[in-house]
Interface confidence: low
Amino acid sequence: EPHSLRYNLTVLSWDGSVQSGFLTEVHLDGQPFLRCDRQKCRAKPQGQWAEDVLGNKTWDRETRDLTGNGKDLRMTLAHIKDQKEGLHSLQEIRVCEIHEDNSTRSSQHFYYDGELFLSQNLETKEWTMPQSSRAQTLAMNVRNFLKEDAMKTKTHYHAMHADCLQELRRYLKSGVVLRRTVPPMVNVTRSEASEGNITVTCRASGFYPWNITLSWRQDGVSLSHDTQQWGDVLPDGNGTYQTWVATRICQGEEQRFTCYMEHSGNHSTHPVPSGKVLVLQSHWQ
């Protein structure tokens, strides 16, 4: 698996007016690494392991770079013509990879309101876009804006590719093993919710890195988002993480429901226990 550095920049508009803030999250080898907050740019390690990678270094350069990128993306959003009422987002995701054979890959992806509409291979400069008319319109809009100053754009994207790889190599030089994977312990419990219904809660704990998929399935099919409640992924104080997902089901139908867990490429399913397992406190608010 290649080493990777991933930048996720988000800017927002409200009723057609681009908001002054932005959010940048940086992942190193798939793990949260730096965060530049909307309110105040604070490029800083996400957790102890990130501090181990770079020691006590200051984040001035990262802060400056991420702030600049945020401004660029705000200008891009301002040039999107189909701004409607309400809240809208423009997301730019840049990824660079170094493979075992030392070859590199770099790409850039734009999302509007969470929908991918434009991608670019930063090495070949090749653009691709989905077939939908909305995506095509957005893509034309953004590409035209980026082409307005072709020289600047060319330099900018070369720099994005080169800087990303340079940063990735610098971070990896620290020698810290980033690929530590600790699988989660998964525990399913049930508690009375109301007459004829029970609440089933699936808890995953002690896992690392923090990226995890946890959801309830009925007859093998994922339940809709609004019938489940998720807990935040939180540190558990041991350098690992914990989270949960809960749903209400009809008593007697327990055997139809399973908790599905996916973490670091591994997945498993966990049935609802039969009989009554007392849970002192329900997570439903």
Epitope: R38, K40, W230, D232, P235, G237, N238, Q285
Partner: antibody
């Protein structure tokens, strides 16, 4: 100017209910988790509850769980705290607070809630 | 829940003194700790976040250190406006508990 302004504090009898509001301005309210923190007269700070930026997740201190409900209306840039079954020990100044995930750098001025018979 | 203890609970000091306040967590919290200053009748004010990062606009005489379970707030040279109560708060996991506070008053 970034600010939070609490309102709704009052003198109420034990067992009664009260709803506090917190109006936000000067920042993108819908991007932030917002918290309630309280301080009893002459005592220290106590974290009360948090609601996620999108309203999906809520967490409460054990001392208020089951009695208080935190909610928000992002269209109105407003946070709420519905306080039910009030007790004398809920008497405090209630602050709303927000900021990045690792600190509260925005605080309201506070609103006083007195629970007394 | 993670408990935070602060020491001392109060201290008397003079202008120009170096003041150190400690905060101890009941379990490891990495660097997820903030320090606040509060004056009577006012809302708390953020001084330090992430255990050692100085909040924008806060004088450099304030500094924070520590990681894991033991943390320190230091005021290198106490000024008249620094007489207040200081609180630590952990952001490692819910509930986001506060320390009981340390009151710094004039000797």
């Amino acid at each position: 100017q970034v600010q939070l302004v609490e309102s709704g504090g009052d003198v109420v009898q034990p067992g009664r209910s009260l709803r506090l509001s917190c109006a936000a301005s000067g920042f993108t309210f819908s991007n932030y988790n917002i918290h309630w923190v309280r301080q009893a007269p002459g005592k220290g700070l106590e974290w009360v509850a948090v609601i996620r930026y999108d309203g999906i997740n809520k967490y409460y201190a054990d001392s208020v769980k089951g009695r208080f409900i935190i909610s928000r209306d992002n269209s109105k840039n407003t946070l709420y705290l519905q306080m039910n079954s009030l007790r004398a020990e809920d008497t405090a100044v209630y602050y709303c607070a927000s900021g990045p995930p690792d600190a509260f750098n925005i605080w309201g001025q506070g609103t006083m809630v007195t629970v007394s018979s | 829940a993670i408990q935070l203890t602060q020491s001392p609970s109060s201290l008397s000091a003079s202008v120009g003194d170096r003041v150190t306040i400690t905060c101890r967590a009941s379990q490891g919290i990495s660097s997820a700790l903030a320090w606040y200053q509060q004056k009577p009748g006012k809302a708390p004010k953020l001084l330090i976040y992430d255990a050692s990062s100085l909040e924008s606009g806060v004088p450099s005489r304030f500094s924070g250190s520590g990681s894991g379970t033991d943390f320190t707030l230091t005021i290198s040279s106490l000024q008249p406006e620094d007489f207040a109560t200081y609180y630590c708060q952990q952001f490692n996991s819910y509930p986001f508990t506060f320390g009981p506070g340390t009151k710094v008053d004039i000797k």
